[in-house]
């Protein structure tokens, strides 16, 4: 090994990072609350829409105090995750109805793959377990029909929308305590 | 500019102990997991440790497991890798390195012979 | 042995473009968790090329270029210049192992 010698500064660092992740989930929750909109606009939903595949929503206003820095970004990593895989079948298998919504899909699936490439590039700085938990992935079938297809979506967006609510809240207090 | 020194290396004899430490600075050190990677002489890198930024994860590898610790003091900026029971593979140049990594030291060379 | 394969050696001529490739399984590349690159200059300490798969820390020339698809990524070095000739490593987190692993290293020859 040569002389000590320092190394020029990388374009980020964790603080960054986690600057960065708070962003992209603000503009992803932007885009998802528009294509929810676009979706009650042309598919009205009748009530409230749930999939037994969907992660359970991971926080609440009254746990956010007590989060801790590898919990949110694990838990967030794993659900988003999850949302993708859901987000990729709706583009596969949403059927004729959806087809109309495949470029906003598209872009919404790009920004999931962004956010989730720096909640990696994150906790890799951070050293942070990567490993998602053992959960059972649900195989993901056919929509059982055009209607079922419709009401999956609702359930997906209004679901992701929840969690990236509860994540920009998280992210930002997190930011304190790095 | 991001500086990390190590020191601590040497020769030493096989069942042996030595204490390496990484001295970190020009950038927050607290905010960054920090690992060691070695290199046998001629060889590819291994890595060897990490330890979260916080210090609340450790992990080792296979080859480490039982006789290396990883510990760092965030007040101080360094980093420290305790080699117990020191063995002839051991022999290589240890690296400090920092976040993905981003960041490597030089490196200090450590020798197990008898 | 490797838990990333990478070929031990390649070559070019000054302007060519050359591409190192890695590949990993199922716990790291594959898992979705990025892949970064190094090289290491002869008796010196590697240095970060190119980390989450395609991104260039600054300073980092735009010769070089990173992909990678499923279980497999790749370190593409256009222009190929005289002070290429180096050592490059791919890494990448493994989610069984809670920490990175590194390929066996490629030898890039300047001919």
């Known amino acids: 090994p040569g002389p000590p010698a320092g190394s020029p500064r990388v374009s980020s660092d964790p603080r960054a990072d986690l600057d960065s992740a708070v962003l992209l989930t603000r503009s992803l929750l932007a885009d998802t609350r528009q294509l929810a909109a676009q979706m009650r606009d042309k598919f009205p939903a009748d009530g409230d829409h749930s999939l037994d595949s969907l992660p359970t929503l991971a926080m609440s206003a009254g746990t956010l105090g007590s989060l801790q820095l590898p919990g949110v970004l694990t838990r967030l990593r794993v659900d988003l995750m999850s949302y993708l895989r859901h987000v990729q079948w709706l583009r596969r298998a949403g059927g004729p109805s959806l087809k109309t919504l495949e470029p906003e899909l598209g872009a919404l699936q790009a920004r999931l793959e962004r956010l989730l490439r720096r909640l990696q590039l994150l906790m890799s700085r951070l050293a942070l377990p990567q490993a998602a938990p053992d959960q059972p992935v649900i195989p993901l079938g056919p929509p059982a029909s055009a209607w079922g297809s419709i009401r999956a979506a609702h359930a997906i967006l209004g679901g992701l929308h929840l969690t990236l609510d509860w994540a920009v809240r998280g992210l930002l207090l997190l930011k304190t305590r790095l | 500019e991001v500086q990390l020194l190590e020191s601590g290396g040497g020769l030493v004899q096989p069942g042996g102990s030595l204490r390496l430490s990484c001295a970190a600075s020009?950038?927050?050190?607290?905010?960054?997991?920090m690992h060691w990677v070695r290199q046998a002489p001629g060889k590819g890198l291994e890595w060897v440790s990490v330890?979260?930024?916080?210090?609340?994860?450790?992990y080792y590898a296979d080859s480490v497991k039982g006789r290396f610790t990883i510990s760092r003091d965030n007040s101080k900026n360094t980093l420290y890798l305790q080699m117990n029971s020191l063995r002839a593979e051991d022999t290589a140049v240890y690296y400090c390195?920092?976040?993905?990594?981003?960041?490597w030291g030089q490196g200090t060379l450590v020798t197990v012979s008898s | 042995q490797s838990v990333l394969t990478q070929p031990p050696s390649a070559s070019g001529t000054p302007g060519q473009r050359v591409t190192i490739s890695c590949t990993g399984s199922?716990?790291?590349?594959?898992?979705?968790?990025?892949v970064h690159w190094y090289q290491q200059l002869p008796g010196t300490a590697p240095k970060l090329l190119i980390y989450?798969?395609?991104e260039r820390p600054s300073g980092v020339p735009d010769r070089f270029s990173g992909s990678k698809s499923g279980t497999s990524a790749s370190l593409a070095i256009s222009g190929l210049r005289s002070e290429d000739e180096a050592d490059y490593y791919c890494?990448?987190?493994?989610?069984?192992?809670?920490?990175?692993?590194f390929g066996g290293g490629t030898k890039l020859t300047v001919l």
């Open positions: 390195a920092a976040g993905v990594p981003d960041y």
């Open positions: 020009g950038f927050t050190f607290s905010s960054y997991g």
């Open positions: 330890i979260s930024y916080d210090g609340s994860y450790k």
């Open positions: 199922s716990s790291n590349i594959g898992a979705g968790l990025d």
């Open positions: 989450s798969n395609n």
């Open positions: 890494a990448a987190w493994d989610d069984s192992l809670n920490g990175p692993v």
